[in-house]
């Protein structure tokens, strides 16, 4: 249905509200190091602009395509080329080509400052002298940290951030009542954003069929009594949805994400019966409600696969005549049938048997050649189930921080090219994995775990390729999205790596330790570890555990001295020469 | 957690018939599939039957299509083998299983609870 101007269908649409929001995140999701000042200034004129368009659709320029305008606005910035560089080469372009050129220019660890959470107090008055402002400059600062962030996500944040300021400011104890809920919006956040990166990446790394895949499943083992060409469709907008969003589209995709729920809340009945709550919400509230359903039962009858997918005469000739789809039937019924595999494994198993389908369907015998198909599915389950065996008894053993400890080493073992804060990161954020799903059941922990793990390891994947350091992480990363959790499983020690110079400024400290969170203490302590392996990645557990030990030690022993900075110095100077005598460096 | 033991097998000459059954506890398995499988001396585990969780839907290995039949009892929380037409081969220690999720109704792996098996033997 195609509307004159494009811009005023969005602003009617969405509303005002939401259109400056999504304008406002869309520019700094692209522009990452302008000031909120230059935003808000960009915005406004994109808004007054749209209500013109609005009142007449035909006067000037409101043909346009939102791609053109939002490029036009974003090329009138200044200082364009002295703060971005190379993206300023983006204007001289044409679109698409512009657009593309912006997102390719997307940084997913901008050199931003730390974002420091001011006094309660301090916070409370200013939302309460300028509350726009205020939640204005959280879209803005969420937004050019997280440049994939979900945008209409972004605004159900925003109003649960609102709704957070708006109650705790009146409360007798506003810091007892705020913080926690800060704290996790923050936790969710960055989860949240986690998530739609490797969505993104999934469409934009391994394009649309991948992702479609992915949706097949996923949505197969959350609505496993709705019908396959009901499943096709939701997957067919669902994609169209991430699509907008990953491309910076972001009005057409809150518009249509909106457009989604709706469907889904008018269909509930053939879709899910766990959808009722969620549609009784207003609509950001409810579309996040319908991402984070709970599965519904399974049909009370479902037959075994065998019958249509091995025992079948018509195998190849179903193949044949429609692949994709013959597969998407294949993905859709074995997930429906198993809520307790990762949508990875799903997704292995799918890429198998059409491995074979392929191989036999052109063989004498197709039958007799994929008859036994479903025994080489027997390993591809059983290795994530023993992993996560493995790795929950020893978190369980551990306790959380030293799980990461554990896995620090062994991926600092594995590519130790990796920068130190990456591996720090991504290693303290896979050691999560067990608070997060050891604690459930059997049938839940597989996909808890592994479809987190492979959230994380896209983190590595795209901080990794910012700037390449190692050609197996470079390999894990790009040759397959499904198998990229068993690339790095795999991975053993790198034999070729030459250990790190021993610098002793790494391993000085100073009383300011003393002062950080807990969590800050053990990003310091996790660092020095990584740097040791670095240092000797032949070390084994023994001496690394005694050095970290002694490490402990020291930092507690000079925190409780009268003269803090005089002990981190003496003491210090003991320890560096201790542990390198105890790792023989 | 679901405990399973199998009773009624024996010694019976080919030719003869035996019942099989797997009585359950500890959960209701309505929404289980459950399956036999068999291990004759020497020799792997091999599936037998399998029956789906209101039993709409069985499903046999070739070698006994036709002989033997697997029903269920969700209201008794107990499956059956009938075995008819029994042959030398059919000896084994007969093995039932739960599987609260089973896409392959064949496979092993996709079942989470097994007995501890009851002998059948066919001798003449």
């Known amino acids: 249905d195609a509307h004159k101007s494009e811009v005023a269908h969005r602003f009617k649409d969405l509303g005002e509200e939401n259109f400056k929001a999504l304008v406002l995140i869309a520019f700094a999701q692209y522009l990452q190091q302008c000031p909120f000042e230059d935003h808000v200034k960009l915005v406004n004129e994109v808004t007054e602009f749209a209500k013109t368009c609005v009142a007449d659709e035909s006067a000037e320029n409101c043909d346009k395509s939102l791609h053109t305008l939002f490029g036009d606005k974003l090329c009138t910035v200044a200082t364009l080329r002295e703060t971005y560089g190379e993206m300023a080469d983006c204007c001289a372009k044409q679109e698409p080509e512009r657009n593309e050129c912006f997102l390719q220019h997307k940084d997913d660890n901008p050199n931003l400052p730390r974002l420091v959470r001011p006094e309660v107090d301090v916070m409370c008055t200013a939302f309460h002298d300028n509350e726009e402002t205020f939640l204005k400059k959280y879209l803005y600062e969420i937004a050019r940290r997280h440049p994939y962030f979900y945008a209409p996500e972004l605004l159900f944040f925003a109003k649960r951030y609102k709704a957070a300021f708006t109650e705790c400011c009146q409360a007798a104890d506003k810091a007892a009542c705020l913080l926690p809920k800060l704290d996790e919006l923050r936790d969710e956040g960055k989860a949240s954003s986690a998530k739609q990166r490797l969505k993104c990446a999934s469409l934009q790394k391994f394009g649309e069929r991948a992702f479609k895949a992915w949706a097949v499943a996923r949505l197969s083992q959350r609505f496993p009594k709705a019908e396959f060409a009901e499943v096709s469709k939701l997957v067919t907008d669902l994609t169209k949805v991430h699509t907008e969003c990953c491309h910076g589209d972001l009005l057409e995709c809150a518009d249509d994400r909106a457009d989604l729920a709706k469907y889904i809340c008018e269909n509930q009945d053939s879709i899910s019966s766990k959808l009722k709550e969620c549609c009784e919400k207003p609509l950001l509230e409810k579309s996040h409600c319908i991402a984070e359903v709970e599965n519904d039962e399974m049909p009370a009858d479902l037959p075994s696969l065998a019958a249509d997918f091995v025992e079948s005469k018509d195998v190849c000739k179903n193949y044949a005549e429609a692949k994709d789809v013959f597969l998407g039937m294949f993905l859709y019924e074995y997930a429906r049938r198993h809520p307790d595999y990762s949508v990875v494994l799903l997704l292995r198993l799918a890429k198998t048997y059409e491995t074979t389908l392929e191989k036999c369907c052109a063989a004498a015998d197709p039958h007799e050649c994929y008859a036994k198909v479903f025994d080489e599915f027997k390993p591809l389950v059983e290795e994530p189930q023993n992993l996560i065996k493995q790795n929950c008894e020893l978190f369980e053993q551990l306790g959380e921080y030293k799980f990461q400890n554990a896995l620090l080493v062994r991926y600092t073992k594995k590519v130790p090219q990796v920068s130190t804060p990456t591996l720090v990161e991504v290693s303290r954020n896979l050691g999560k994995v067990g608070s997060k799903c050891c604690k459930h059941p059997e049938a839940k922990r597989m996909p808890c775990a592994e479809d987190y793990l492979s959230v994380v390891l896209n983190q590595l994947c795209v901080l990794h390729e910012k700037t390449p350091v190692s050609d197996r992480v470079t390999k894990c990363c790009t040759e397959s999205l499904v198998n990229r959790r068993p690339c790095f499983s795999a991975l053993e020690v790198d034999e070729t790596y030459v250990p790190k110079e021993f610098n002793a400024e790494t391993f000085t400290f100073h009383a300011d330790i003393c002062t950080l969170s807990e969590k800050e203490r053990q990003i310091k302590k996790q660092t020095a570890l990584v740097e040791l392996v670095k240092h000797k990645p032949k070390a084994t557990k023994e001496q690394l555990k005694a050095v970290m030990d002694d490490f402990a030690a020291f930092v507690e022993k000079c925190c409780k001295a009268d003269d803090k900075e005089t002990c981190f110095a003496e003491e210090g100077k003991k320890l560096v020469a201790a542990s390198q005598a105890a790792l023989g460096l | 957690e679901v405990q399973l033991v199998e009773s009624g097998g024996g010694v019976v000459q080919p030719g003869g018939s035996l019942r099989l059954s797997c009585a359950a506890s500890?959960?209701?398995?309505?929404?289980?599939?459950m399956g036999w499988f068999r291990q004759a001396p020497g020799k792997e585990r091999e599936f037998v039957a399998a029956?789906?969780?209101?039993?709409?839907?069985?499903y046999y290995a070739d070698s006994v299509k036709g002989r033997f039949t697997i029903s269920r009892d969700n209201s008794k929380n107990t499956v059956y083998l009938q075995m008819n037409s029994l042959r030398p081969e059919d000896t084994a220690l007969y093995y039932c299983?739960?599987?609260?999720?089973?896409?392959?109704?064949?496979?092993?792996?996709?079942?989470?609870?097994w007995g501890q098996g009851t002998l059948v033997t066919v001798s003449s």
């Open positions: 029956i789906s969780r209101s039993g709409g839907y069985t």
């Open positions: 299983a739960a599987g609260r999720y089973s896409a392959w109704y064949s496979q092993s792996y996709e079942y989470d609870y």
């Open positions: 500890g959960s209701t398995i309505s929404s289980y599939v």
